[in-house]
């Protein structure tokens, strides 16, 4: 009975040619969609001239099919029982699942202006950049199409910089025809309890972005976990999108297409300040914006983004401290809509449904030397967009799962 099932599971979740897990792992059978909501700024002039609160109105969803490409450069290493791979990036726009087209226009923060003023705090460099910003007729805000904002555009200000800088800017630029990795994960042949756990990422066991244990690459990539998941477990996983490892805790039992799954959620504690959760002390990397590490709910990932002042949060600043959102009007955080969850089939450890939600923000600060930022009287963590990446096991796959896994156990 149980021993036979355990033996079968242990055999079939190993990441090697011929197993059920491997086939689905190489190229996911689940359709994964990434929905974007863009924060359209309603009062750009008032913000720039009077340092008013930024009034935003979210527009979306704009939906893309993602993660449809098979893993590349899959290489087994029998010596240490690992398999390495690249995860190619690709996004296909889905008009039928979107409120508009990729040509829709949005008023958003000028990414290049905000980033340049942060990367180059030196007054002389800023005054040089200011002359180029003025010459290019750039401002604090800009109007961009969805396609430009997400996937990249040639910035007029950066095009005037007479030094070798990349003139292309976009929230996810470059994306298509790029790959995430190399990941090297345990294949589970020697110990099934390690299957899918990341050994190294980009050839290293650490990220070099954080101090101490915050810098560790923990757990899996969240697509699956070692089998026989217990409700009491804290599931660790690494997300390259947020440049850190994070964790999920059990919330509830869920029935997904007749399959009993455990819903694991990212708890608010994971986003807490070091004051509330001392474990998070090494995710606080500066003292000013974080108000001496008392702010919570935003993560400064600038070190992972070539110095660009990118802050990651949950959508609408869910679980964030009031000081973070006090400069922004029009946000409505809602736990049901804006939290991240993973629905895990506990026997196999496979994630059969998930919703990964995150918001990308950019810090903009007053600058005495950049005219378009001169009138600002305070710092703003400006929401640019939030995304909801979802995947649910298909009906056929669910049927197969019911018959081959859960059915056999019941």
């Amino acid at each position: 009975g149980d021993m036979l099932i355990q033996k079968t599971i242990k055999k079939e979740v190993v990441l090697e040619e011929g197993t059920i897990a491997f086939k689905n792992w190489v190229k996911t059978g689940t359709e994964i969609y990434r929905q974007f909501w863009i924060f359209d700024v309603q009062n750009p002039q008032e913000v720039m001239m009077n340092s008013s609160n930024i009034q935003v109105k979210q527009r979306g969803p704009y939906t893309y099919r993602v993660r449809f490409l098979a893993k590349e450069n899959i290489t087994q290493d029998p010596k240490d029982n690992t398999v390495s791979f690249l995860q190619p990036n690709g996004a296909i726009f889905e008009p039928s699942l979107s409120v508009g087209t990729e040509a829709d226009n949005f008023t958003v923060l000028n990414l290049a202006v905000a980033a340049a003023s942060h990367i180059y705090p030196n007054p002389f460099v800023q005054v040089v950049l200011n002359s180029l910003i003025n010459k290019s007729k750039s401002s604090m805000f800009q109007v961009r199409t969805l396609r430009e904002l997400l996937w990249g555009y040639t910035d007029p200000f950066l095009s005037l910089v007479p030094y070798p800088v990349s003139t292309r800017v976009g929230m996810f630029y470059p994306y298509n025809n790029t790959a995430d990795g190399v990941y090297k994960v345990f294949n589970g042949k020697d110990s099934i309890s390690k299957v899918a756990i990341i050994d190294t990422y980009k050839g290293k066991r650490n990220l070099s972005y954080w101090e101490s244990y915050c810098d560790m690459i923990n757990g899996t990539d969240a697509a699956s976990f070692p089998p026989f998941v217990e409700k009491s477990q804290v599931l660790q996983f690494f997300s390259s999108d947020i440049c850190r490892s994070i964790y999920a805790v059990f919330e509830s039992d869920v029935n997904l297409k007749g399959i009993p799954v455990y819903r694991f959620v990212l708890p608010s504690k994971a986003f807490a300040s070091p004051v509330q959760n001392p474990d998070n002390h090494c995710f606080c990397t500066e003292k000013i914006i974080s108000k001496n590490c008392t702010s919570y709910g935003v993560l400064d990932i600038s070190k992972c983004k070539e110095g660009k002042p990118v802050y990651i949060s949950l959508p609408h600043f869910l679980y964030a401290s009031p000081d973070v959102s006090e400069t922004i009007d029009g946000l409505n955080p809602n736990e049901e809509e804006h939290r991240t969850y993973l629905d895990i089939e506990p026997i196999t450890g496979f994630t059969l449904q998930f919703a990964k939600r995150l918001q990308v923000n950019l810090l903009v600060k007053p600058s005495n030397k950049i005219q378009v930022l001169k009138r600002l009287k305070r710092n703003y963590i400006v929401p640019i967009l939030w995304l909801n990446e979802t995947g649910t096991i298909g009906d056929e796959k669910a049927k197969m799962f019911r018959s081959q896994v859960t059915g056999k156990i019941n």
Partner: antibody
């Protein structure tokens, strides 16, 4: 005390070139932005060129028409101004000046000056 | 380019009197005005930097006010050692531009 010593000035004919140097006694020279400023015979002060601490950013007013090149050698703690196609209107006392907005002194432009080196352009 | 108009071109004042020099800019430069003193045979010396900030070691009789386009530099009780040329400099935008200078003499 900050000491800046300019050299390389002299009498040249129109169309000729000249290279000015400015030596600093400061250990922290590589941390500071620098400029060349000139004082004309009419006693007008004009910014000629500026360069940031690592030499990555330079600036020239349009009026200089790219005839001048500012550079620096941080290992030698020296600032340079290569001047070409010199004209009579370039006749001036050329000063090198260090910007002083380190340690949060924002906007202390041309905080320290050398004694200057005289450039005379005449046929 | 921001032009800076400095007045007067020269000034003859008695010891102990209050000296005022004015600079007007062609564009709004907030408070990005600087003031320099140049004595004969010496390089210019920065007295007051952006934000009407008196530089360390500069006597408190020197001061400046102004914001936007109109700026005034003052010496409260003129001393004989204050005889010099005085220049204003706008540092709001490139190219930084100097005023034409004011020659201060003793009456």
């Amino acid at each position: 005390e900050v000491q800046l010593v300019e050299s390389g000035g002299g009498l040249v004919q129109p169309g000729e070139s000249l290279k000015l140097s400015c030596e600093s006694n400061e250990y922290e020279f590589p941390s500071h932005d620098m400029s060349w400023v000139r004082k004309t015979p009419e006693k007008r002060l004009e910014l000629v060129a500026a360069i940031n601490s690592d030499g990555g950013y330079t600036y020239y007013p349009d009026t200089m028409e790219r005839r001048f090149i500012i550079s620096r050698d941080n290992t030698k703690k020296t600032l340079y101004l290569q001047m070409s196609s010199l004209r009579s209107e370039d006749t001036a006392l050329y000063y090198c000046a260090r910007h002083g907005y380190d340690y949060d002194e924002e906007g202390a432009w041309f905080a320290y000056w050398g004694q200057g080196t005289l450039v005379t352009v005449s046929a | 380019e921001t032009t800076v108009t400095q007045s007067p071109a020269s000034l003859s004042m008695a010891i102990g009197e209050k000296v005022t020099i004015r600079c007007i800019t062609s564009t709004d430069i907030d408070d990005d005005m600087n003031w320099y003193q140049q004595k004969p045979g010496e390089p210019p010396k920065l007295l007051i930097s952006e934000g009407n900030t008196l530089r360390p070691g500069v006597p408190s009789r020197f001061s400046s006010t102004g914001y936007g386009t109109d700026f005034v530099f003052s010496i409260e009780n003129m001393l004989s050692e204050d005889v010099a040329d005085y220049y204003c400099l706008q540092s709001d935008n490139l190219p930084f531009t100097f005023g034409s200078g004011t020659k201060l003499e003793i009456k």
